[in-house]
Every structure is written in C-alpha cells, then in structure tokens.
C-alpha cells in the first residue's frame, strides 16, 4: 500500500505532528509577568493541533524535540519609547511541573520594539510553557506582531 | 516493506514536503512596496520545491500549515542611518486571492538594520504571499542578508 | 501494517530526522573569530542526533535541506555598550570543505545586544558549519541566550 494512502488512513496525531500557533489574549495582573495566550480558528489564524491551553499557558501533549518560536512587539512603540523605559525582557520557559522549570529562550528589547527568535528544545508531555514579559511596557495584541508557537520536530 | 524504501519509491511531493527559499531580485517601482523574489539552483542556494514564483511573488501549491520565515537587511545601513529615516516596516501577507488578503507578520526597523522572524500559519493552494517594505531605504540583495522562505509543516 | 508501528520499528536516522541544538562552549583565540559549540544531554538541553561536532564546529552527516537557526546575545550588554564598540557581526557559513565555503546567514548587532535568525539551506554530508563573531564583544554563554541549531527538513 502506498505511504500516501496509509498517511490518509491514520489520524495525524499518530504521526506526531503536534503544532500550535497562538495570539496574545491579555497580560496578567501587575505582579504576574506572564502573557496569556489564546488560539483557535474562530480567532483568526491561530490554532492548536495536539498541545492545549491551560489558563492561557501552552501545555505539551507529546514527548519530543520541538521548535519553539515567538515574536513580541511592544504597543505604541518607537526606539525613543523603548529607550525611555527600563529594560523589557521576554523569557520563554517551562514553568510546570516545577521539577522541570527552566528558561529556554531569553531576549531583551534594548532600543527596539520587537523581539523574535526560535529554538529547538526537548519537551515532555505535561510540560507547560510560560512567556514572561518583565518591564512596564504593554505588548501589542495585533496578530501579525505578537505570536507564539511550537512545532513537534522528532521524538 | 521498509518505510525507507517506500519513501524512495514515492515522489517527495506526495509526502507534502513543499519548501522554498528565495533571494531578493529587485524592489518594485516607486508606488509598489513589494519586494520581488527569485529562486533556483542557478542563482546560488535558493530553491523552490512545490511553491512557484508568480511575477516575483511566492504562490503556494499545497494546502497546509507552513512555517514562513524572512530576514531583510537594509543596504548601506547603520543605526544612525536607520534612525534618520521614517520608520521602515516589513509586512508579509497573503495578497491574493483578495478574499484571503491578510497581514501575517509585521516588523519595524527601529534603530536596527535587520529584521528576522518566523511564524506558523495555515496557507491554501493558490495563496500568493507578498512582502511589503514601506519606507525609503533600499534592502540589501546579498543572499546571506535578505531571504524569504516557506516550509510545509503539516496538513 | 500501521505506519505508526512501522515508524517504531525503524531507527529514526532512516527517516532523515537529523537535528542538533548546541550551546556556546567558548570563543576562539584572538585571531580566530569562530564560536566553539558543545552539545549533549549532560550539558543541559543541547543535543546532537545525526550531526556531529568537530573541534566545536558542526558537521553535517546527511544530505538535504536544513533549517539553520541561531541566537547570539552579547555579554554584559546594553544598547549603550553595543553602540560604543565597532560593529559586531555574526555570520554562519559552510567553512569546509573549502570548495563549498559560503556565507549562509549574516547579521549585525547595531544598537542591540541580541541577534536571532533562521533560514533554509541545502547542506551536504561532510559540510562543516562555522559561526564567526567579528568584533570585540564577548558573547553570553547562558544557554537561553546563545544557541545554534539545525534541523533536517527534506532531501
């Protein structure tokens, strides 16, 4: 039997193609630096195929190596704005379970208004990823300026 | 039958491995903010496997979720140059069919000379991606400084 | 037979899922602009599945199109620091064999302290990738700030 046919007969989930792309929902209360995400076709071009959202944070459902990517743009921002405020930093990390807590990716907005990066990292079922924005600038909610996603790459 | 053998017997296209990496050909006339791309082994390390170029714009041939990535560097640029001009912004979006027109990814060069980002997005057969560079600074045509690509990730 | 089962019976290498994510080990001696990388689970979240390290440089073991990505952050850096020094530039390229030597990706730190980018490029078995950091600023060795990786995408 041709692989292409076999591929159609199996649910995609069994091929390990977990993937998610999220858009910003809101920021947390003052002492909570986390960004809260949302996803789904009703919201536009965001989606979750495999991973899930748990109170606005992304939870992994399949062990493997993932490509994690993020872009965050600060609202009403120019290089002048950025320089007028204390350094704003974005960190993506595993925030639960606590035993696996670690920072995976960190960037500062120096005199810029956007950060964007990506990396490969092993993640395990149940890992929850948090994106912490420290600083006092509000991020843009435009879906083409601020987004966060993961793509399963291999076991 | 071993999967590795089956894989060799099937055309790659049937596995859905559409991928393209393009280099800058030229900018548009004054009122046209689009960048015009080119690709192919004769040009260096750029290529199109599945997607096609339509008058310098990238047209998708297979439905699916794609990783879209781009880097654009401004020519003869320093942070001083960048700050002396009106904000230069790069936007990647679906420009046709008009019914699906949307901005997918947007970044500004604040006091920097390079932007680079990537995102996951659903694309459909026939979608044409345009990359609009607004501002009065010319982009570099160096193939290691300015490039644009897509990679099919899953159905 | 189900593909999911077939997948488990074959070594992953036969599926062409070569992937590596590296962390910075050290910089070279004064006249050597190369960054020297390290990887492996004992070091944290870095790994090599397929590619190998040759004296701190990444050597490819399988022909194909790869997604190459990198992030480099300068140590003890602010936008003031960055602007006070001669331009610092990062270039990723094939450095051996000499006949295939080429720059694949290049970025400058203008008034920023981090660069991050990614691109698709064809690589061949035996290609060694070098990451050259020119300038007089030391890169951060924090594993969430400086990393370099490749992912096999298709033949």
């Amino acid at each position: 039997q041709r692989f292409a046919q076999a591929q159609q007969q199996l649910p995609l989930e069994s091929l390990g193609w977990d993937v998610a792309e999220l858009q910003l929902n809101h920021t947390g209360p003052q002492q909570d630096p986390r960004l809260y995400w949302q996803g789904g076709p009703a919201l536009g071009r965001s989606f979750l195929h495999g991973p899930e959202l748990d109170k606005g944070q992304l939870r992994i459902h399949r062990d493997g190596i993932y490509m994690v990517h993020i872009q965050v743009t600060l609202a009403i921002c120019s290089s002048t704005t950025a320089s007028r405020h204390h350094p704003t930093t974005l960190a993506v990390g595993i925030c639960s379970p606590a035993s696996r807590s670690i920072s995976l990716l960190r960037l500062s907005f120096h005199q810029g208004c956007t950060i964007a990066s990506q990396r490969l990292t092993p993640l395990a079922r149940g890992d929850t990823l948090c994106t912490n924005l420290t600083g006092t600038l509000l991020p843009s909610r435009n879906t083409d300026e601020t987004f966060f996603g993961v793509q399963w790459v291999r076991p | 039958q071993r999967f590795a053998q089956a894989q060799q017997q099937l055309p790659l296209e049937s596995l859905g491995w559409d991928v393209a990496e393009l280099q800058l050909n030229h900018t548009g006339p004054q009122q046209d903010p689009r960048l015009y791309w080119q690709g192919g082994p004769a040009l260096g390390r750029s290529f199109l496997h599945g997607p096609e170029l339509d008058k310098g714009q990238l047209r998708i041939h297979r439905d699916g979720i794609y990783m879209v990535h781009i880097q654009v560097t401004l020519a003869i640029c320093s942070s001083t140059t960048a700050s002396r001009h009106h904000p230069t912004t790069l936007a990647v979006g679906i420009c046709s069919p008009a019914s699906r027109s949307i901005s997918l990814l947007r970044l500004s060069f604040h006091q920097g000379c390079t932007i680079a980002s990537q995102r996951l997005t659903p694309l459909a057969r026939g979608d044409t991606l345009c990359t609009n560079l607004t501002g009065t600074l010319l982009p570099s045509r160096n193939t290691d400084e300015t490039f644009f690509g897509v990679q099919w990730v899953r159905p | 037979q189900r593909f999911a089962q077939a997948q488990q019976q074959l070594p992953l290498e036969s599926l062409g899922w070569d992937v590596a994510e590296l962390q910075l080990n050290h910089t070279g001696p004064q006249q050597d602009p190369r960054l020297y990388w390290q990887g492996g689970p004992a070091l944290g979240r870095s790994f090599l599945h397929g590619p190998e390290l040759d004296k701190g440089q990444l050597r490819i073991h399988r022909d194909g199109i790869y997604m190459v990505h990198i992030q480099v952050t300068l140590a003890i850096c602010s936008s003031t620091t960055a602007s006070r020094h001669h331009p610092t530039t990062l270039a990723v390229g094939i450095c051996s064999p000499a006949s295939r030597s080429i720059s694949l990706l290049r970025l400058s730190f203008h008034q920023g302290c981090t660069i991050a980018s990614q691109r698709l490029t064809p690589l061949a078995r035996g290609d060694t990738l070098c990451t050259n950091l020119t300038g007089t600023l030391l890169p951060s060795r924090n594993t969430d700030e400086t990393f370099f990786g490749v992912q096999w995408v298709r033949p």
Epitope: T27, I76, T81, S83, H85, H86, T136, L138, P139, N142 | - | -
Partner: antibody, heavy 120, light 111 residues
Framework: QVQLQQSGPGLVQPSQSLSITCTVS????????VHWVRQSPGKGLEWLGV???????DYNAAFISRLSISKDNSKSQVFFKMNSLQSDDIAIYYC??????????????WGQGTSVTVSS | DIVLTQSPASLAVSLGQRATISCRAS??????????MHWYQQKPGQPPKLLIY???NLESGVPARFSGSGSGTDFTLNIHPVEEEDAATYYC?????????FGAGTKLELK
C-alpha cells in the same frame, strides 16, 4: 496606599517661576512615571509633560521652552518648574501617576492639586 | 495634536436611567490591538478619577454600572443605572501619541 501630595506656593508674580513638589508614597518612582496636568476654566484639562521611571522627560511642545520636570527617587519626590508665568497660566496644577504599563499613558492616581494665581 | 470632541456638553438623567456620553477623536486612537482612550470622573473640588482605560476596561474599585465601548474615532461611556453619586463632569483622554489630550468634558446632572 498610593498617594501623591503636592506642595508649592499658590501665588506667583507675572514673569516669575512656579515650582511645585509632588511627594509620592505607596509606589516607587523607579517603576512608575508621573504626569503633570493643569486645569483652567478657559482651556479645560491640559497635559504638560511626564517624567518616566528612567528619569527621561517628555513635554507638551506648547510648553517645552519654559517647563522642567525632574525627580529624586530616593526621596520619592518629583519637581515641577514652569518659567515666565502669565495670567493665562492661572490654573490648578496636578501631578498624577501613570499606571503600571508605561505606554498606557493614563493617570490612575492624582495629587490634590495646587491652585495657582498669577498676580503682582 | 489629536482633538477630542465630547457630546453633549451637559445632560440631565433620572435616577436609575442610562446616561450615554460620546467622545469623538479627530483621528483613530487604535493601534497595537487596543483603543488608547480613557475616561475620568471629576467632582467639584476634587482631582479627576480614572474610570475606564483602553476604551472598555474597568479600573479597579469602579462600580460595574460604568462601561466603555468604541474603537477607532468613536467612543462611548455608559452609566446604568445612574445613581445620585454619579453627578459629576466626565472627561475622555487619548494616549495614542504625545501630547496627550482631553475632551472638554460632559456635565452629568440628576433630574
């Protein structure tokens, strides 16, 4: 709790300077910005300027030549000085805290106001 | 500078009824996925008090009878049901760019 307490003279002679001190409590000037706004019957509420948490200032272009805002983080004090006062500067002058997000540029807590009269 | 035009200049509303105040900006105050418009209440002898930020977000401690809506250039503050303590002057303020500007105010009186 958050408070902004203003102190300064209510009467200024024409062409002289107005100086107001805004002493804050319940929050840190290293985290929050402070705006200055005035209110007069003729012109309503007018934004004058702001001092950001970093100490950098932005002024309304209409007042930039005669306005100066500074601060002392350790004393939790913000200093407002406007030169060359004339009769159309008669107003109530307020200091007000910017909310946590610096680019929100609203005012969530206000001082009690300093009523300023210009007269010889 | 962005000019904010409030209407009406004054209105009288009975207890328990709805009060609607409008604010129109001379250009859009929307950017970055937010509407940078805020609403304040001011009573005689007091400084203004923030009620609503980013067009529709209720400031902490403000009663739920206050609500804000709108986007682009047209914004509305609603009070329902109006209570006796709501007699005051209401101002809109934008923060899309510097300088920040305020509307001229709407005086709400009780019938």
């Amino acid at each position: 709790q958050v408070q902004l307490q203003q102190s300064g003279p209510g009467l200024v002679q024409p062409s002289q300077s107005l100086s107001i001190t805004c002493t804050v409590s319940g929050f840190s000037l290293t985290t929050y910005a402070v705006h200055w706004v005035r209110q007069s019957p003729g012109k309503g509420l007018e934004w004058l300027g702001v001092i950001w948490s970093t100490g950098i200032t932005d002024y309304n272009a209409a007042f930039i030549s005669r306005l100066s805002i500074s601060k002392d983080n350790s004393k939790s004090q913000v200093f407002f000085k406007m030169n060359s006062l004339q009769s159309d500067d008669i107003a109530i002058y307020y200091c007000a805290r910017n909310p946590y997000y610096g680019n929100l540029n609203a005012m969530d807590y206000w001082g009690q106001g300093t009523s300023v009269t210009v007269s010889s | 500078d962005i000019v904010l035009t409030q209407s009406p200049a004054s209105l009288a509303v009975s207890l328990g009824q709805r009060a609607t105040i409008s604010c129109r900006a001379s250009k859009s105050v929307d950017t970055s996925g937010y509407s940078f418009m805020h609403w304040y209440q001011q009573k005689p002898g007091q400084p203004p008090k923030l009620l609503i930020y980013l067009a529709s977000n209720l400031e902490s401690g403000v009663p739920a009878r206050f609500s804000g809506s709108g986007s682009g250039t047209d914004f509305t503050l609603n009070i329902h049901p109006v209570e006796e303590e709501d007699a005051a002057t209401y101002y809109c303020q934008h923060s899309r760019e510097l300088p920040l500007t305020f509307g001229a105010g709407t005086k709400l009186e009780l019938k």
